[in-house]
């Protein structure tokens, strides 16, 4: 059964297909699930989950976050604004999700899943967009270099870029879910 | 505190036309989904649309669509329903409603209504 | 375009434990995690009570309390007390981007 759908879905065919909102809501709650699942597997692991030092490696990294100007908040939502911000931020997601990928021994399948479902999620929501206006692309050769660079550290900030990245990608999801059930 | 306050209801000719307009404030409107929901004499509550906060989506129950079109001007902190072709079964209390913040179809504020009565 | 299903009236004794159903569909009730329950009194509009299935809206004392299994979700209400006594409203997402009410259930609070 694909990411996003019902075996009761694809068993009866006489249903009608999602709407649009529909999938996107439940591609974002598939990821969600994905996402705790890794979580579940580096807080075993190691003690990033409780570590004070997370600040530290933070400011190594440039994670997509929502701010007040996205228009995603409850406070100033503006649907097109937000919609283009979700998109953006998940397109500068996808080099951080490619880092994700041999990070985990036991949940490798999980972790492909994430990251295969998160393009499937952008299509989506181009399609959605498609009226919006162009939005930017990270630059791939950017992406290339930061792989290198993040591949390059050493265990402990390996560990804990890894965790970051779990713990943004969850965050930005879940806003993400609450903005666009307002559109 | 958060109002919601309709208008424009009336009595009407089956085949004729209103247009109900319900006042926001207390609150961002421009943050918030909004919905029609009415309630004929007697009976049940029954959705009718849904338009998204930047009103860019729009969605109907099958026994409106096609007659009934829902719109909203955030600079006036208005939302509209302009009802067309009206018939018997359409009268009702029309209320407007807010959707509940980054949940699924819950309505967490409602107006008092405005009666709508189409006879001829 | 049918209606999700309860029954028109419950009755209980104050200080009692009384339950309402909803009974949907596949395409409704039980399609999510989207059922929301209203509380109306006579001439007034509704007030949400329940969304999300078992959560509780802002200032709703905890006397209520939302659930669901397969295809139809219920309402609980314990402690049942006389102002309590009014019509009790479910709503459901429905695929394809609508949404339906149940028929409404009126509670009766005894003696």
């Known amino acids: 059964v694909p990411p996003g759908e019902d075996s009761k879905d694809v068993a009866a065919p006489h249903r009608q297909p999602l709407t649009s909102s529909e999938r996107i809501d439940k591609q974002i709650r598939y990821i969600l699930d994905g996402i705790s699942a890794l979580r579940k597997e580096t807080c075993n692991k190691s003690n990033m989950c409780e570590s004070s030092k997370e600040a530290l490696a933070e400011n190594n990294l440039n994670l997509p976050k929502m701010a007040e100007k996205d228009g995603c908040f409850q406070s100033g939502f503006n649907e097109e604004t937000c919609l283009v911000k979700i998109i953006t931020g998940l397109l500068e997601f996808e080099v951080y999700l490619e880092y994700l990928q041999n990070r985990f021994e036991s949940s490798e399948e999980q972790a492909r899943a994430v990251q295969m479902s998160t393009k499937v999620l952008i299509q989506f929501l181009q399609k959605k967009a498609k009226n919006l206006d162009a939005i930017t692309t990270p630059d791939p050769t950017t992406n290339a270099s930061l792989l290198t660079k993040l591949q390059a550290q050493n265990q402990w900030l390996q560990d804990m870029t890894t965790h970051l990245i779990l713990r943004s990608f969850k965050e930005f999801l879940q806003s993400s879910l609450r903005a666009l059930r307002q559109m | 505190e958060v109002q919601l306050v309709e208008s424009g209801g009336g009595l009407v000719q089956p085949g004729g036309s209103l247009r109900l307009s319900c006042a926001a404030s207390g609150f961002t409107f421009s943050s918030y989904a909004m919905s029609w929901v009415r309630q004929a004499p007697g009976k049940g509550l029954e959705w009718v649309s849904r338009?998204?906060?930047?009103?860019?989506?729009?969605y109907y129950a099958d026994s409106v669509k096609g007659r009934f079109t829902i719109s909203r001007d955030n600079a006036k902190n208005t939302l509209y329903l302009q009802m067309n072709s009206l018939k018997p079964e359409d009268t009702a209390v029309y209320y407007c409603v807010r959707y509940a913040w980054g949940v699924q179809w819950a309505f967490d504020f409602w107006g008092q209504g405005t009666q709508v009565t189409v006879s001829s | 375009q049918s209606v999700v299903t309860q029954p028109p009236s419950v009755s209980g004794s104050p200080g009692k434990t009384v339950t309402i159903s909803c009974a949907g569909t596949?395409?409704?009730?039980?399609?999510?995690?989207?059922v929301s329950w209203y509380q109306q009194l006579p001439g007034m509009a509704p007030k949400l009570l329940i969304y999300?299935?078992?959560k509780r809206a802002s200032g709703i004392a905890d006397r209520f309390s939302g659930s669901k299994s397969g295809n139809t979700a219920s309402l609980t209400i314990s402690g049942l007390q006389s102002e309590d006594e009014a019509d009790y409203v479910c709503a459901s997402y429905r695929r394809g981007g609508t949404a339906v009410f149940g028929g409404g259930t009126h509670l009766t609070v005894l003696g």
């Open positions: 338009i998204s906060s930047g009103g860019i989506s729009t």
């Open positions: 999300d299935v078992s």
């Open positions: 596949s395409s409704d009730v039980g399609y999510g995690n989207y």
